[in-house]
Interface confidence: medium
């Protein structure tokens, strides 16, 4: 991967296909690396990240990490090569439509991550399919 | 290393009133929300209050509104409970406990050693 | 508010055995249950949050399962420490819900 903003253009010289043997493009993602979040007990945020970038490589896909210790939440939004390990973790999930967090064990430090492979998916993250719609406010001042 | 430390239990009168705190280590309390959580003796668990991690919202469990009143400072990294017309039902040890926020979870973690209130003439 | 209610409320067993606890909600709270553990006089320690996550520092014995109104608990070979009382309880809505306790006994 590469910042976002450095201008992207594509490697004409690695044509990549898909298992249909179509040219492969490469992905549009949401890329602002780490920003702080205000994401927090919810069914699903937005990225609030304003950068659309065309991934470097025709194989990258999408990824958001989300992270929250005692000072603060980060949301990270970048590429990356699903062949290869993101914070020390095989992306799983890439082939997903939808950027799903699944928990990872960090000490020190909730840490989800998701990937996934339609275009800007990882603007849309999303924690639980089903969640709580009763009294949410009440709960943040139980458990928040 | 988290420690929470209940005091202020003991003995009371019916219709008499007393004040838990709970001091707290070894994490940044203004980033949690907190609360009581009692048991009776020989009982199971029964949450009772909780106080938003800024102080700015409560929430109390039915039997004990207009009775209760939690509350915390961020400076002193001490919570606290008011207990007023305090009933032989309310007879327990109470906890405090640490609450934890995460999309798609919510728990209690970790407790103090808690402290034991008696309402009895 | 939502009721959870867990069996059996004792069981006696063996060092070795393979425990099991259920725990059933009056409606659905998802995946929103977590599972304690008490010994007397002392505080409840957090094992398993979100009904399949194990708490950092908990035995790999532990291990949760369930959705929706039913969850389960397993000590896959019970040890000497585990017996105490064991709790599950809703964070699905307020207010926050508890099991009546599952007391495990030595046979």
């Known amino acids: 991967t590469i910042p976002p903003h450095v201008q992207k253009s594509v490697n004409n010289d690695m044509i990549v296909t898909d298992n249909n043997g179509a040219v492969k493009f490469p992905q549009l993602c949401k890329f602002c690396d780490v920003r702080f979040s205000t994401c927090d007990n919810q069914k699903s945020c937005m990225s609030n990240c304003s950068i659309t970038s065309a991934c470097e490589k025709p194989q990258e896909v999408c990824v958001a990490v989300w992270r929250k210790n005692d000072e603060n939440i980060t949301l990270e939004t970048v590429c990356h090569d699903p062949k290869l390990p993101y914070h020390d973790f095989i992306l799983e999930d890439a082939a997903s439509p939808k950027c799903i967090m699944k928990e990872k064990k960090k000490p020190g430090e909730t840490f989800f991550m998701c990937s996934c492979s339609s275009d800007e998916c990882n603007d849309n993250i999303i924690f639980s399919e089903e969640y709580n719609t009763s009294n949410p406010d009440l709960l943040l001042v139980i458990f928040q | 290393q988290v420690q929470l430390v209940e005091s202020g239990g003991g003995l009371v009168q019916p219709g008499g009133s007393l004040r838990l705190s709970c001091a707290v280590s070894?994490?940044?309390?203004?980033?949690?929300?907190m609360s009581w959580v009692r048991q009776a003796p020989g009982k199971g668990l029964e949450w009772v209050s909780a106080i938003s991690a800024s102080g700015d919202r409560t929430h109390n469990t039915d039997s004990v509104k207009g009775r209760f009143s939690i509350s915390r400072d961020n400076s002193k990294n001490t919570l606290y409970l008011q207990m007023n017309s305090l009933r032989a039902e309310d007879t327990a040890v109470y906890f405090c406990?640490?609450?934890?926020?995460?999309?798609?979870?919510?728990?209690?973690?970790?407790w103090g050693q808690g402290t034991l209130v008696t309402v009895s003439s | 508010d939502i009721q959870m209610t867990q069996s059996p409320s004792s069981l006696s067993a063996s060092v070795g055995d393979r425990v099991t606890i259920t725990c059933r909600a009056s409606q659905s709270i998802s995946s929103y249950l977590n599972w304690y553990q008490q010994k007397p006089g002392k505080a409840p320690k957090l094992l398993i949050y979100a009904a399949s996550s194990l708490q950092s520092g908990v035995p790999s014995r532990f291990s949760g399962s369930g959705s929706g109104t039913d969850f389960t608990l397993t000590i896959s070979s019970l040890q000497p420490e585990d017996f105490a009382t064991y709790y599950c309880q809703q964070s699905y809505s307020t207010p926050p819900t508890f099991g009546q306790g599952t007391k495990v006994e030595i046979k």
């Open positions: 406990a640490k609450g934890i926020a995460a999309s798609g979870k919510n728990y209690f973690d970790p």
């Open positions: 070894g994490f940044t309390f203004r980033r949690y929300a």
